[in-house]
């Protein structure tokens, strides 16, 4: 079977343009080398958001520009997206890799509909 | 464990035909997309064709439609590309790929690939 991973449907971004959400995946085997990467699609065109390889029970390390922070606990990830503005609303979806120790297992998430709504601009004061 | 098994590859002069098969087992899902890449020296790995598992969507490289047809076999678990008018542009190493996607995911997106093949060789040359 594939390997099953598990995110939630629908996530509001908070008014600073943040949205988390938790990655979580049944593991077959005991990993000890994990790679998360958040996929974003829309329109049927899919683009790489970040990506991070970690080992279990250590941190999550992004790039250092990346928009992604993340925490591990057993099989869950728990994920941040930040910066995010209204054109950025879309399906994020978590892919896992279990990359050691072999077999290598791969499962794909069907995807948080994050929503992104751009705050109004505070209006003049006189 | 997914394994994927690709044969068929060789030499062929320009203006031949080959068949590649690959043989799929240890993936029990009835839903997901295989499909077959090439990677020539110093290139990217691309996508040449694709097939989803259920309902045949199919998706192929601008260079090589009207030339390549993919098929697929169910009960053999067995992907085919056929090959024809082929050209010196097409040598390269064919891997076959299958990503374990459903149905909210769009159809033959590379970054859901994560199972490959070990590569057959082709080389059209006279």
């Known amino acids: 079977k594939a390997m099953h991973v598990a995110q939630p449907a629908v996530v509001l971004a908070n008014s600073r343009g943040t949205a988390s959400f938790v990655c979580e995946y049944a593991s077959p085997g005991k990993a000890t080398e994990v790679r998360v990467t958040v996929l974003r699609q829309a329109d049927s065109q899919v683009t790489e958001v970040c990506a991070a390889t970690y080992m279990m029970g250590n941190e999550l390390t992004f790039l250092d520009d990346s928009i992604c922070t993340g925490t591990s606990s057993g099989n869950q990830v728990n994920l941040t997206i930040q910066g995010l503005r209204a054109m950025d609303t879309g399906l994020y979806i978590c892919k896992v890799e279990l990359m050691y120790p072999p077999p290598y297992y791969m499962g794909i998430g069907n995807g948080t509909q994050i929503y992104v709504i751009d705050p109004e601009p505070c209006p003049d004061s006189d | 464990e997914v394994q994927l098994v690709e044969s068929g590859g060789g030499l062929v002069q320009p203006g031949g035909s080959l068949r590649l098969s690959c043989a799929a087992s240890g993936f029990s899902s009835d839903y997901y997309d295989i499909g077959w890449f090439r990677q020539a020296p110093g290139k990217e790995r691309e996508m040449v064709s694709c097939i989803r598992s259920s309902g045949g969507s199919t998706k192929y490289a601008d260079s090589v439609k009207g030339r390549f047809t993919i098929s697929r076999d169910n009960s053999k678990n067995t992907v085919y590309l056929q090959m024809n008018s082929l050209r010196a542009e097409d040598t390269a190493v064919y891997y076959c790929?299958?990503?374990?996607?459903?149905?909210?995911?769009?159809?033959?997106?590379?970054?859901?690939?994560?199972?490959w093949g070990q590569g057959t060789r082709v080389t059209v040359s006279s």
């Open positions: 790929g299958l990503a374990p996607i459903s149905p909210v995911h769009a159809v033959c997106n590379q970054h859901y690939f994560g199972y």
